[in-house]
Amino acid sequence: VEVATHYLEIITQLIVESFHFKNGEDAPDLLKVITKPFTKLIVQLDKKVISQIAMNDEKAKNKSLVKIWCKTFTNKTQINVTVPSTANCTSPSLCWTDGIQNWTMKNVTYKENIAKCQHIFVNFHLPDL
């Protein structure tokens, strides 16, 4: 039937033309929509780690490219910490003493892992190389 009518070719052409691609660069976006759900089930990469590697950040050296946690909770809070002297304070108004140690306020970010990603390699713990 396909040989005689070329119906698949014609239908596919009509579908693709309905997207009104302005240039060849728009076409891969359609492929992304089709393939992304499937690739996400195979492996997910950590974009932050990729960015750190690109920026030559030392922190990225021992981090895995494979994304493990997809749902996290970040809590920003202030804690009191000791400093060697008042010169090390974040600001004079945020500095005090108890006669023994000098203290200041410091902003701290706590990251809590909530849910793991749903892909094949999430529990493999394989080296990136």
Partner: antibody, heavy 124, light 106 residues
Amino acid sequence: QVQLQESGPELVKPSETLSITCTVSGGSISSRSYYWGWIRQPPGKGLEWIGSIYYGGSTYYNPSLKSRVTISADTSKNQFSLKLNSVTAADTAVFYCVRHPAGYSTRWSAFDIWGQGTMVTVSS
Amino acid sequence: EIVLTQSPSSLSASVGDRVTITCRASQSISSYLNWYQQKPGRAPELLIYAASSLQSGVPSRFSGSGSGTDFTLTISSLQPEDFATYYCQQSFSSLTFGQGTRLEIK
């Protein structure tokens, strides 16, 4: 409420080591919020801070006594102790164990809780 | 070491009197100053912390003021139980006490 109780010998011979223990009830000495310290008062005289111990076992001493003082803690018994070596008659005093807030939890510090004190006499 | 000098060393007053005790620091200690009351044979008790804050349970006739190097403890109307020795103490750099002020009945 937090209570402090000193215990130790009332008489120590010159050149020996004075040892006193303070038992804390109603609160934990493992708290980041407080220092636990020692103050002495010779008969008819004023008060002198000897030293204090803080969370994690960090110790702080009065510079004038530093070479002779050791303060330690036993968190399992909720006790902290004072050792003062090479004592002389000048070390005869009432010894108080005290609590004072650390800057971790507040922006002021004062000796807010005191033990009743124990009189230690240095004499042969 | 920060030295605290109290004045007077002793004073006599009567019940109902207004009494002021001063404490001078050898260098500026901001508001890091505390006041204690000690009765014979007893441990000292905290009255005022941070120069002017009244410790919980302390009668309101006690008040503190000052900043920097000069501080005062005021008893607005002396009561019989107020006759005792008073000490100032700084927590700005290490922990030191004043020599004490003995308050006696006139």
